[in-house]
Amino acid sequence: AILGRSETQECLFFNANWEKDRTNQTGVEPCYGDKDKRRHCFATWKNISGSIEIVKQGCWLDDINCYDRTDCVEKKDSPEVYFCCCEGNMCNEKFSYFPEMEVTQPTSNPVTPKPPYYN
């Protein structure tokens, strides 16, 4: 790690469209990028009537919005599709929704999907 920063070298990979895209459904993805760029992990999911459906997980490009985030947390209020990114190996294994609301007290809803997402 440089200056105490947690370097991302690999992330959990998931693709809900794996059959259409002809990829694996799950796995570990090595993260590559230019030497001067930071690397991140991400997760994208939907909440369908309270049921969590992961769309994608994998590596993410150098993005200031992901800097120094050890946990993968979505903070937008009720998005159609949830997205979070983080730094650190496999940091996208777990992800959560913690909306930043102006009036109401934030509530944490950690999402820990059951298999087959994590084998």
Partner: antibody, heavy 120, light 107 residues
């Protein structure tokens, strides 16, 4: 310095075949996904095909599926596009472009392109 | 396939003007939105990736914003070298798709 150099374009009759090549230098080719994007004369950009860093995953636009094949030779730092059953609407400048990881395809470096003309 | 709609298709502006180009996706693409600049006879060049991140060497007058389905590319003070065609592109789902382009011309 990252460089991508396409070759193999030219004039071909409808129904014919061509193989485009893209020679990469200035970066670790085997660490990046690669893509082909085309641009018909006076038109916008159309993504054609993509391949991940080790050739394990490929993806195609519906317009070329079953006719075009993307491949790579990491030992030669070269990307290929085999184009069969060519049609007039395939006439375009074909660019190879570097991606990053499979899910975050921002195309950060592009070659200068090679012109493919399909005409009788 | 996800459709990307850019507006306007062309615009005329003067050096120093603030220019805004919009891009709308037919469904949510979260943060999977990139912007490219293309000059006549040249290859496209990546300007902005992941909605807001500037690519290497891109001047700070270029900025991106938005999320979900609606995105914006802003040039805060147009320079002579900025007259070109700009494309948005989504990478949320395969196939990758581009907007139709916005040509920025000299007024």
């Amino acid at each position: 310095e990252v460089q991508l150099l396409e070759s193999g374009g030219g004039l071909v009759q409808p129904g014919g075949s061509l193989r485009l090549s893209c020679a990469a230098s200035g970066f670790t080719f085997s660490s990046y996904s690669m893509n082909w994007v085309r641009q018909a004369p006076g038109k916008g950009l159309e993504w054609v095909a993509g391949i991940n860093y080790n050739g394990g995953y490929t993806s195609y636009a519906d317009s070329v599926k079953g006719r075009f094949t993307i491949s790579r030779d990491n030992s030669k730092n070269t990307l290929y596009l085999q184009m069969n059953s060519l049609r007039a609407e395939d006439t375009a400048v074909y660019y190879c472009a570097r991606g990053a990881n499979w899910h975050d395809t921002a195309l950060d470096y592009w070659g200068q392109g090679t012109l493919v003309t399909v005409s009788s | 396939d996800i459709q990307m709609t850019q507006s306007p298709s062309s615009l005329s502006a003067s050096v120093g003007d603030r220019v805004t180009i919009t891009c709308r996706a037919s469904q949510s693409i979260v943060s999977y939105l990139n912007w490219y600049q293309q000059k006549p006879g040249k290859a496209p060049k990546l300007l902005i990736y992941a909605v807001t991140s500037r690519a290497s060497g891109v001047p700070s007058r270029f900025s991106g914003s938005g999320s979900g389905t609606d995105f914006t590319l802003t040039i805060s003070s147009l320079q002579p070298e900025d007259f070109a065609t700009y494309y948005c592109q989504q990478s949320y789902d395969s196939p990758l798709t581009f907007g139709g382009g916005t040509k920025v011309e000299i007024k």
